[in-house]
């Protein structure tokens, strides 16, 4: 009855600091309310990056000031994290919780290592 969550092992952020990955879960029950949370793990410290709750069949909505956006389709969530810099390189864990109806189920992915490389500043051009 454990819920399994799959996510890619490694993702490289774009030069604009955007990283996208898919978080897929195998649901042990018929949930109508699902909560998706992205956690960042660094030096055994875990912090919450963003979270969203959605009703099955509806769109995933993060808070307006969130650095995350996403879309959902069945048991699959497409997550995008924006505004990343080199210092944000780390392990990003997808956590899925089936909130309603009871019982509650938890699923934690193994994490996606996101590598962020700050773009080189453009050299001054003399024309």
């Amino acid at each position: 009855k454990a819920m399994h969550v799959a996510q890619p092992a490694v993702v490289l952020a774009s030069s604009r600091g955007i990283a996208s990955f898919v978080c897929e879960y195998a649901s042990p029950g018929k949930a109508t309310e699902v909560r998706v949370t992205v956690l960042r793990q660094a030096d055994s410290q875990v912090t919450e990056v963003c979270a969203a709750t959605y009703m099955m069949g509806n769109e995933l909505t993060f808070l307006d000031d969130s650095i995350c956006t996403g879309t959902s389709s069945g048991n699959q969530v497409n997550l995008t994290i924006q505004g990343l810099r080199a210092m944000d390189t780390g392990l990003y864990i997808c956590k899925v919780e089936l909130m309603y109806p009871p019982p509650y189920y938890l699923g934690i992915g193994n994490g996606t290592q996101i590598y962020v490389i700050d773009p080189e500043p453009c050299p001054d051009s003399d024309f």
Partner: antibody
Framework: QVQLVESGGGVVQPGRSLRLSCAAS????????MHWVRQAPGKGLEWVAV????????YYADSVKGRFTISRDDSRYTLYLQMNSLRAEDTAVYYC?????????????WGQGTLVTVSS | EIVLTQSPGTLSLSPGERATLSCRAS???????LAWYQQKPGQAPRLLIY???SRATGIPDRFSGSGSGTDFTLTISRLEPEDFAVYYC?????????FGPGTKVDIK
């Protein structure tokens, strides 16, 4: 440092009510799910209830469902457990515990507990 | 509801010895969702291990956890005087969150 201090325990007659409080400090209370866990004298641990960090979801053990209500006041950094229709088998030390960021069901910090005795 | 059983009920050992505590689940628990707690008389429990094998902050490395599926183990490599206590396993993968009945580690 994280601190959780329970209060409100005491001796109460069967069928009566009691409200427990848990005062939190040392962390951002509104960011964490919170639990009540109890331990009958000389017995093991039993999870009682959880409330999500934003109060949106609450779950209860079958043994207390319909009788106990968990709630929180984030402005006061306080967790509550309203216990109605108390029974002798509710006699226990009641602990409040913080759920971790990684998983709400991991109890990473505990209070020292408050004793509730249900007896006529 | 996932029922957890622990064995042995009591473990009598001497300081310096190795302690091996077992926790068995009535149905499969992903290894990510099992925790161990230590409780001393008159005190609140303390988190030792989560995710079956990850040590909580400040827990000495003589404590280690292992296992998967339905069988989990807490090992204390060399017992220190302060390790004599009751140990509980707990699953947090689904509600209701459940504890095992505990194993008491006492001094031989």
């Amino acid at each position: 440092q994280v601190q959780l201090v329970e209060s409100g325990g005491g001796v109460v007659q069967p069928g009566r009510s009691l409200r427990l409080s848990c005062a939190a400090s040392g962390f951002t209370f509104s960011s964490y799910g919170m639990h009540w866990v109890r331990q009958a004298p000389g017995k093991g641990l039993e999870w009682v209830a959880v409330i999500w960090y934003d109060g949106s979801n609450k779950y209860y053990a079958d043994s207390v469902k319909g009788r106990f209500t968990i709630s929180r006041d984030d402005s006061r950094y306080t967790l509550y457990l309203q216990m109605n229709s108390l029974r002798a088998e509710d006699t226990a030390v009641y602990y409040c515990a913080r759920g971790s960021i990684l998983a709400a069901g991991i109890f990473d910090y505990w209070g020292q507990g408050t004793l509730v005795t249900v007896s006529s | 509801e996932i029922v957890l059983t622990q064995s042995p009920g009591t473990l009598s050992l001497s300081p310096g010895e190795r302690a091996t505590l077992s926790c068995r689940a009535s149905q499969s628990v992903s290894s990510s969702y099992l925790a161990w707690y230590q409780q001393k008389p008159g005190q609140a429990p303390r988190l030792l291990i989560y995710g079956a094998s990850s040590r909580a902050t400040g827990i000495p490395d003589r404590f280690s956890g292992s296992g998967s599926g339905t069988d989990f183990t807490l090992t204390i490599s060399r017992l220190e005087p302060e390790d004599f206590a009751v140990y509980y396993c707990q699953q947090y993968g689904s509600s209701p969150f459940t504890f095992g009945p505990g194993t008491k580690v006492d001094i031989k």
